[in-house]
Interface confidence: low
Amino acid sequence: EAYKSEIAHRYNDLGEEHFRGLVLVAFSQYLQQCPFEDHVKLAKEVTEFAKACAAEESGANCDKSLHTLFGDKLCTVASLRDKYGDMADCCEKQEPDRNECFLAHKDDNPGFPPLVAPEPDALCAAFQDNEQLFLGKYLYEIARRHPYFYAPELLYYAQQYKGVFAECCQAADKAACLGPKIEALREKVLLSSAKERFKCASLQKFGDRAFKAWSVARLSQRFPKADFAEISKVVTDLTKVHKECCHGDLLECADDRADLAKYMCENQDSISTKLKECCDKPVLEKSQCLAEVERDELPGDLPSLAADFVEDKEVCKNYQEAKDVFLGTFLYEYARRHPEYSVSLLLRLAKEYEATLEKCCATDDPPTCYAKVLDEFKPLVDEPQNLVKTNCELFEKLGEYGFQNALLVRYTKKAPQVSTPTLVEVSRKLGKVGTKCCKKPESERMSCAEDFLSVVLNRLCVLHEKTPVSERVTKCCSESLVNRRPCFSGLEVDETYVPKEFNAETFTFHADLCTLPEAEKQVKKQTALVELLKHKPKATDEQLKTVMGDFGAFVEKCCAAENKEGCFSEEGPKLVAAAQAALV
């Protein structure tokens, strides 16, 4: 359906509040360095304009595309050249090139300091004084730090954030109420950001087909009672939604997401028995609930996979006539029968099946050639199962911090050229897989672990792509989306690496270390561990354990000393000398 005014259409569909929030998010994701006040002003102007167009669709400029309107508005920012350098050149281009140019300048690692919450009383005063501005600041701060955040989901989290303050600002002990709730929300937001970044990378680097295959597998596991046509319909719509959000088309994305939620609720009988509760909620909660809905029970009468995909005499004919549809049905049938498998594993199995058919359908006797194809999946299934088992055992033995350190050593040896902050960030996140997944029942462990690892390794790939330094990282990141994790797991020590020169400054510590929160203390120690490895890549685990133990004792000693700074400057060089001697 063609609308006279696209902006009026979206304003009417989304309503003023969601429209303004999405515009604020869009601008904050594009111009990450601009102050909050500038973005509020831009969002207000665009919303006022949309409102005018909704009242009179044939008004001046109301017929312009959203990209043209948004781009023109961004290009009015006076500080564009000073703050963003060559991003200002985007404004010389015409649409759609101008929008592509803005997208290309999104910075996945803008380097803003972590958000530190002021005192609870000050926060509550700000919340009560101007709720809308308070929530706008939240949207802005998250969006500029996470330029690919899934915008409609961010509106949902802002609503949750509002709920937390509405409750806790009435509490007797505001801090005790806010602390754990804000932290829990923060964890969810960070995971949501990483998951969407993975989806955007799938679409941008590997195309629609990769994203659709991922979605077919995931949704078939979740909705095993739905038929393939239903899954395909939802996947097609979901792909459109994520393509729009990843492409910066946030109004269209949010609108289409609401339409998809409406469709799923109207057709829940043919999708899943678990949707009812979600479908009674308002739009933001409804979409979120559907995205997180529990798995439906498997239908009881599923026939053997072999019948359709091995024993049928028409396998090659079916495959050759409509390859993607046939492979899609294979993936759907396999996934709905195996909720315990990770999506990545299911996609590897589909890829293996595809390669087998490609080879066998060209032979004189295809059925004999592919007769054992399902048995050939065993090593592909065993590999992630064994990996999860081994790593969960290690996690249980070492705890989260120790497990992170083991991964730090592992990944620094695999890719010592990668920057230290990236190695620390990624290894810390990889280590959280233990906490997140190892306590789950056996039937959920693999799915939880491998799919979480894929999301974290995507962060490594995204950061590495910005400044590529390791050919092996580039290779693992770009060759195959589903084989990224096995590719990284399979990397051995990089024997070509030339050790980094020793720099005493890197191992100089000060008294301010003592007052840092525990997590930041860990980061400092882990940074030292990585630098140590870059200097002495041949260090054994035993040597590293000794040196890190000494380092922990040194920090503890100096933090307990009367003259902390004096202790650090006196004892530090001794520790470094001892470490160097121990690692010869």
Partner: nanobody, 126 residues
Framework: EVQLLESGGGLVQPGGSLRLSCAAS????????VAWFRQAPGKEREFVAG????????YYADSVKGRFTISRDNSKNTLYLQMNSLRPEDTAVYYC???????????????????WGQGTLVTVSS
């Protein structure tokens, strides 16, 4: 980084044949999805044929199915397009495009290909 260089274009009569070549350097051609696109004067660039990375799955535009064949020689790191039964409407500049990362399929969307050759002109006329 992939460099692509097409050759083999020229003038041919309707019903005739031509074989285009695309020599790749900077990356092995079997590690990348490669495709032929064409652009006729005043028209948009369109997908002609493609071949996946890793597995030789081929795709063709409906207008060339049965007449054109895409293939590659990994030992020569070269992609080919054998064009038979040429028609005047096949007249265009033919481009070779590459999409690294071993995707199993080739996309028909030009934007997804980061690497392009400079093109070779094919004219079908009597």
């Amino acid at each position: 980084e992939v460099q692509l260089l097409e050759s083999g274009g020229g003038l041919v009569q309707p019903g005739g044949s031509l074989r285009l070549s695309c020599a790749a350097s900077g990356r092995y051609i079997d590690e990348t999805a490669v495709a032929w696109f064409r652009q006729a004067p005043g028209k948009e660039r369109e997908f002609v044929a493609g071949i996946g990375g890793g597995v030789d799955i081929t795709y063709y535009a409906d207008s060339v199915k049965g007449r054109f064949t895409i293939s590659r020689d990994n030992s020569k790191n070269t992609l080919y397009l054998q064009m038979n039964s040429l028609r005047p409407e096949d007249t265009a500049v033919y481009y070779c495009a590459a999409r690294p990362g071993k995707p199993l399929i080739t996309s028909k969307v030009a934007d997804l290909y980061p690497y392009w050759g400079q093109g070779t002109l094919v004219t079908v006329s009597s």
